[in-house]
Amino acid sequence: LTCLGGFASPGPVPPSTALRELIEELVNITQNQKAPLCNGSMVWSINLTAGMYCAALESLINVSGCSAIEKTQRMLSGFCPHKVSAGQFSSLHVRDTKIEVAQFVKDLLLHLKKLFREGQFN
């Protein structure tokens, strides 16, 4: 989690701070959404359970050329213990369901807020 505070982070970021920063970024994306996010790109829906940070990254990493979610992709990689590359899929994907990136972000944001409220940071 060291790098989650941004590139100029002075040291390890507490998990609660890292999660808050991810929430802040997703709120920022939601608030600033004028045109369809990532041109309405579709991604695999995921089960919001244990391991969902990697699953979320695996879904979003397949969206290319969308600067709005680049920071989110970087932040999610800090929560995922293994390296994720495009085309990778975990069992957490709901493989028959694709949703717009905007809906994906909303669903993820709600879940992360609940985790933050419950004190589940990792």
Epitope: L110, K113, K114
Partner: antibody
Framework: QVQLVQSGAEVKKPGSSVKVSCKAS????????MHWVRQAPGQGLEWMGT????????KYVPKFQGRVTITADESTSTAYMELSSLRSEDTAVYYC??????????????????WGQGTLVTVSS | DIVMTQSPLSLPVTPGEPASISCRSS???????????LEWYLQKPGQSPRLLIY???DRFSGVPDRFSGSGSGTDFTLKISRVEADDVGIYYC?????????FGQGTKLEIK
Amino acid sequence: QVQLVQSGAEVKKPGSSVKVSCKASGFYIKDTYMHWVRQAPGQGLEWMGTIDPANGNTKYVPKFQGRVTITADESTSTAYMELSSLRSEDTAVYYCARSIYDDYHVDDYYAMDYWGQGTLVTVSS
Amino acid sequence: DIVMTQSPLSLPVTPGEPASISCRSSQNIVHINGNTYLEWYLQKPGQSPRLLIYKISDRFSGVPDRFSGSGSGTDFTLKISRVEADDVGIYYCFQGSHVPWTFGQGTKLEIK
């Protein structure tokens, strides 16, 4: 507009069970926590437990553990509280309440911002 | 369980005068995420409770600015700058930081 409408008053025998419903409208229950709070006649408020309707996760007060079951049905936007092995001390008004989350605030835990009208459960032989 | 103790239990106030209710928790109620989930509710006679203040000092929408919350750690206060006749009822503090979440025993505000 936001509403929580609870089922009607119940009279129950000691040892039996009661199931109170709370029908939500004006919002998606998956975006909330749904809570249950009770109030015995002339007494204060007592939090009983909560459910996250998005995944069914529950938290209960230990004194009710094993006797209370909180559930939620996303398809009907309804939360339920079932209390078993009823005794006279369970005579109370039972309230449901929600805590909502939205997309536009970083930390928007709005506490129990809307409440149902209450359901009187009377336990008497 | 965390015990929330309110004082006074009864509070007679003259309209236009200020009022203050204290709430003390038996242990620190700072949540692991850094927030303090201390709330205040008002229950008017024959009605369901309604939210006034959350996270110590955040006023819920529609709540008059005559109501304010303050405090930290284990000591919290609800202040009404100028009491109105409509403010009568029972005021409850509540902690939502540590399960099981708990209410104070209530403070009955009445008009002198």
